[in-house]
């Protein structure tokens, strides 16, 4: 039996700059029941506070609801592990909520096979920003990627689309079924997970319908 190992704050992420969650890796428990507490202060302020919500985001996590989330403030976050034999504290993590945004994936992905005047076929991929994203006010601006592959292929083909919420994919094989996903990233944040997969078959004998 021994004091607990040093916990490590794994990551902090916000879906929308309005709430955020931090997760930690516990380290060894020293063979004893061990309690974990997350404490934080804000840069330039003296007070230290304990995590407001250990439940919402699951085990080894702390959820900061709107009430506890400030932007333009740096949070200094530590996790403390305690058992009968002693305690240990993680290295502090400095968090600016503006820089930890990991949004939900884009929504309303639509796929349509179309044809140019020269009869060249393409796949028109369109989508919308994630629901929470207030793109129009400039609170968020998102960049996007799409990825696609034929059902037979092993590797995805990735296309960066910048701030555009549509993309035309050329040089697809007739008769093949293609899988498509999108993801997004805010100016100062992380890529979302890839969104729901959609599929479409490129017809063998595609003719433009009026």
């Amino acid at each position: 039996q021994s004091p607990p190992g040093k916990p490590e704050i794994h990551k902090c992420r916000s879906p929308d700059k309005e709430t955020f969650t931090c997760w930690w890796n516990p380290g060894s428990d020293g063979g004893l029941p061990t309690n974990y507490s997350l404490t934080y202060s804000k840069e330039g302020e003296k007070n230290t506070y304990e995590c407001p919500d250990y439940k919402t985001s699951g085990p080894n996590s702390c959820f900061f609801s709107k009430q506890y989330t400030s932007i333009w403030k740096i949070y200094i976050i530590t996790v403390n592990a305690t058992n009968e034999m002693g305690s240990s504290t993680s290295d502090p993590l400095y968090v600016d909520v503006t820089y930890i945004v990991e949004p939900e994936p884009p929504r309303n992905l639509t796929l349509e096979v179309k044809q140019l005047k020269d009869k060249k076929t393409y796949l028109w991929v369109k989508w919308l920003p994630p629901t929470i994203t207030d793109v129009k006010t400039g609170w968020f601006t998102m960049e996007y990627e799409i990825r696609l592959k034929s059902e037979e292929a092993d590797e995805w083909e990735i296309h960066f689309t910048g701030h555009q919420t549509q993309f035309k994919v050329f040089d697809l094989y007739p008769g093949q079924k293609y899988l498509v996903q999108t993801r997004c990233k805010p100016d100062h944040g992380y890529w979302s997970r890839w969104g729901q997969e959609k599929s479409i078959e490129i017809p063998n004998d595609f003719t433009l319908k009026d």
């Epitope: 601006t141 083909e157 960066f160 689309t161 910048g162 701030h163 100016d187």
Partner: antibody
Framework: EVQLVQSGAEVKKPGASVKVSCKAS????????IHWVRQAPGQGLEWMGY????????GYNQKFKSRVTMTTDTSTSTAYMELRSLRSDDTAVYYC?????????????WGQGTTVTVSS | DIQMTQSPSSLSASVGDRVTITCRAS??????LAWYQQKPGKPPKLLVY???TLAEGVPSRFSGSGSGTDFTLTISSLQPEDFATYYC?????????FGQGTKLEIK
């Protein structure tokens, strides 16, 4: 016919700011990205960033991020690039260029260039 | 950031020659490569995008090839108006970067 017409040459002192304009015509302004690229005397091309006029989304080269602002005025189909805290090594020809309507980063039409000279 | 390396940096050739310029990316950029031609005092002109697609109005003596990290621009039969500086540029993801340029001169 697609055209990008840029504002005239500028001479600035170190520490000042410059704002270059780029007026687009011959296409739907909000459908295409506008990129800004610069070229120092006798040097190669350096990408500074881009703006998508449809939603004013921007992507900047980290090298310039703290000093540059790209904006658009959709009512006049004009893009602007402001560079602050000018230094002598910012002396260059600044180009605006239209991004391809599908692929973001290739530039199919270019402005004539605006010469910015930074000198004390 | 993705680095783009062009070779050669300069090249002397004669009218009618076949000329190849190469460009190497520091990581996989799939087919997201563009080629530009620039003449003194003028803005660059797009020749090729997506590694091999000729831009509108570009003569068929220009062609692009390659994917992944290695790319080439070929001029099948040099014309007097082709003497210029050529730049490659990746358009895979921001920041977009250019090669250092290849100056094509008359021998």
């Amino acid at each position: 016919e697609v055209q990008l017409v840029q504002s005239g040459a500028e001479v600035k002192k170190p520490g000042a700011s410059v704002k270059v304009s780029c007026k687009a015509s011959g296409y739907t302004f909000t459908d295409y990205n506008i990129h800004w690229v610069r070229q120092a005397p006798g040097q190669g091309l350096e990408w500074m960033g881009y703006i998508y006029p449809n939603n004013d989304g921007t992507g900047y080269n980290q090298k310039f991020k703290s000093r540059v602002t790209m904006t658009t005025d959709t009512s006049t189909s004009t893009a602007y690039m402001e560079l602050r805290s000018l230094r002598s090594d910012d002396t260059a020809v600044y180009y605006c260029a239209r991004g391809d309507g599908n692929y973001v980063g290739d530039m199919d039409y270019w402005g004539q260039g605006t010469t910015v000279t930074v000198s004390s | 950031d993705i680095q783009m390396t062009q070779s050669p940096s300069s090249l002397s050739a004669s009218v009618g020659d076949r000329v190849t310029i190469t460009c190497r990316a520091s990581e996989n950029i799939y087919s997201y490569l563009a080629w530009y031609q620039q003449k003194p005092g003028k803005p660059p002109k797009l020749l090729v995008y997506n590694a091999k697609t000729l831009a509108e109005g570009v003569p068929s003596r220009f062609s692009g090839s390659g994917s992944g990290t290695d790319f080439t621009l070929t001029i099948s039969s040099l014309q007097p108006e082709d003497f210029a500086t050529y730049y490659c540029q990746h358009h895979y993801a921001t920041p977009f970067t250019f090669g250092q340029g290849t100056k094509l001169e008359i021998k």
